[in-house]
Interface confidence: medium
């Protein structure tokens, strides 16, 4: 564009600036060793030191490790960004009893209200369940309409909060390939080596090349390239696409240049422990314990608990979904503790693949 010429000319002869055709303006050239915080930096403050993936730049200008949420009892609340740590919190159904910087050192299961008590305030990631005496003549299981919603997830009854000790060794990682293993055993194994090929044994669509052509000289309109099976995240880092190579997972969406592959549990399984873009632990669609009934609460951060059903009632752990599909089994099924903000219609028929939202972070194999 001829009209751009004067603007472009203002950059020539000024070694500290360059002209960016994409935004049609002069941009400040970050000094060697510094990284622009925006596409077209205007001043030195728009440049910063660069950190390795999974490190952030702290106030003292040091690259500092983002905390890891890979322990089984933690989920990622906010991701690792260039200028702030990842933040972890206790997974749904648990609360933090000993806090740590950007994380929780010790998570406990939410308490179950004892007989004659009802939930006053449901448990959250930060606070335990608060109970209050039930009104006379009201069944503890249905003291309020909120307590009679369809179930979201559940925990085993606890007389008092139960700690989950921080995982050691490989317990902080995801399940390994092999459908014959017990889910609990598998939960401590790894999914993918960082140097392994695409999870499904075929090349994924090139995640690094953008539709744009190679850079014009001096242009800022260059998208960073990532190797196959990696995608460019919001922080401009090449991040590994999750692997769906475990026997209990299927690929929902492929690895793209700017988004991860997403995996879900294969039909007939339900996600018991979610992970970013995947599921850390899929278990076969469960059978309900005859002597329990779920006590639902708010879905997002809170969790349900099991308690004895009121006398003369039959526990119904498998309500018909809102879309009218018949449940997978007519026998009562016990709701799982599902670490997600999933659809409120739970359980899900075995014929439907389970897609649960991401809250945890998969850990790449150490090689």
């Amino acid at each position: 564009f001829p009209q751009d010429r004067p603007f472009e000319d203002t950059c020539h002869g000024n070694p500290s600036h360059y002209y960016d055709k994409a935004v049609r303006r002069c941009c400040y050239r970050c000094p060697m060793g510094l990284f622009p915080t925006q596409q077209c930096p205007q001043r030195p403050t728009d440049c910063r030191k660069q950190c390795e993936p999974d490190y952030y730049l702290d106030e003292a200008d040091r690259c500092t490790a983002c905390v890891t949420c890979s322990r089984d009892d933690l989920v990622e609340k906010t991701p690792c960004a260039w200028n702030s740590s990842r933040v972890c919190e206790c997974r749904p159904g648990m609360f933090c009893s000993t806090s740590a910087v950007n994380s929780c050192a010790r998570c406990f299961f939410h308490s179950v209200c004892p007989a004659g008590m009802i939930v006053k305030f449901p448990g959250t990631a930060q606070k335990n369940t608060v109970c209050e005496p039930a009104s006379p003549g009201v069944s503890p299981a249905c003291a309020s309409p909120e307590n009679c919603k369809e179930p979201s997830s559940g925990t085993i009854p606890q007389a008092k909060p139960t700690p989950v000790s921080p995982a050691t060794s490989s317990a902080s990682t995801m399940p390994v390939r092999g459908g014959t293993r017990l889910a609990q055993e598998a939960a401590s194994k790894l999914t993918r080596a960082p140097d392994s090929p695409s999870s499904v044994g075929r090349p994924s669509s090139d995640p690094g090349l953008s539709p744009t052509q190679p850079c014009p000289e001096g242009s800022g309109d260059c998208r960073k390239q990532c190797e196959p099976d990696y995608y460019l995240d919001e922080a401009g880092r090449c991040t590994a696409c999750v692997s769906c190579s475990r026997d209990d997972l299927v690929e929902k969406t492929p690895c793209a240049w700017n988004s991860s592959r997403t995996c879900e549990c294969r039909p007939g399984m339900i996600c018991a422990t979610s992970a970013t873009n995947s599921c850390a632990r899929c278990v076969p669609y469960p059978i309900c314990a005859a002597e329990t009934v779920t006590k639902p609460q708010d879905m997002a951060e809170k969790d349900t608990t099991f308690e004895a059903p009121p006398l003369g009632t039959q526990p119904d752990c498998n309500p018909t979904p809102e879309n009218g599909e018949a449940p997978a089994s007519t026998s009562p099924t016990q709701s799982l503790l599902v670490d997600s903000q999933a659809s409120k219609t739970l359980p899900i028929p075995t014929s439907a693949p389970v897609a649960l939202s991401s809250t945890g972070k998969p850990v790449l194999d150490a090689g």
């Epitope: 060793g33 140097d195 190797e227």
Partner: antibody, heavy 120, light 107 residues
């Protein structure tokens, strides 16, 4: 499997420079930043700095800023470290190191080391 | 810079003993601590990271623990092949720093 093959021992005079290499294989070279670590005889380990082979970006331990220069050649999957103005204090084994993964997993893969001896 | 202090330069032990090596950081490193084993003439070998996560292929007799500024590496039953130099390292923030090392020797 991941391998980091370092160049052979160097004997240098005070004031001179040496340039050592670290050839990476078994993984995509540009995916992982390459770190360098110094170990003086009978002493501990010191982190020198790292390079992002994909972009050439470097960051150094303040202590080594005027001593070490890190570079990388993507075409040969090789990282280099040049040490300048050598003194007897620079006599040490130098390792190139790669992380195991990016979950804060630290130095899982080490080269065999390059011994630098500085003497008149 | 964060200073990592290994107070014991040497530790004497016998095969089959339980031994604990300690490391203290000059500030809270949020469990971002790794442990390495180095034998004479060899490169260091990663054992533990994030204070307690065992690296691939490391025997389960090696256990790491700790939080804040205090960290330990425990070998539950020392084997002959465990006699080596052990370093702690903070992988919390740059510049990454190591302890001075603890040499495990036979009594």
């Amino acid at each position: 499997q991941v391998q980091l093959q370092q160049s052979g021992a160097e004997l240098a005079k005070p004031g001179a420079s040496v340039k050592m290499s670290c050839k990476a294989s078994g993984y995509t070279f540009t995916t992982y930043w390459m770190h360098w670590v110094k170990q003086r005889p009978g002493q501990g380990l010191e982190w020198i700095g790292y390079i992002n082979p994909s972009t050439g970006y470097t960051d150094y331990n303040e202590k080594f800023k005027d001593k070490a220069t890190l570079t990388a050649d993507k075409s040969s999957s090789t990282a280099y470290m040049q040490l300048s103005s050598l003194t007897s204090e620079d006599s040490a084994v130098y390792y190139c190191v790669r992380r195991g993964s990016y979950d804060g997993n630290p130095f899982a893969y080490w080269g065999q080391g390059t011994l630098v001896s500085v003497s008149a | 810079d964060i200073v990592m202090t290994q107070s014991h330069k040497f530790m004497s032990t016998s095969v089959g003993d339980r031994v604990t090596i300690t490391c203290k950081a000059s500030q809270d490193v949020s469990t971002a601590v790794a442990w390495y084993q180095q034998k004479p003439g060899h490169s260091p070998k990663l054992l533990i990271y994030w204070a307690s996560t065992r690296h691939t292929g490391v025997p389960d007799r090696f256990t790491g623990s700790g939080s804040g500024t205090d960290y330990t590496l425990t070998i539950s039953s020392v084997q002959v092949e465990d006699l080596a130099l052990y370093y702690c390292q903070q992988h919390y923030s740059t510049p990454f720093t190591f302890g001075s090392g603890t040499k495990l020797e036979i009594k």
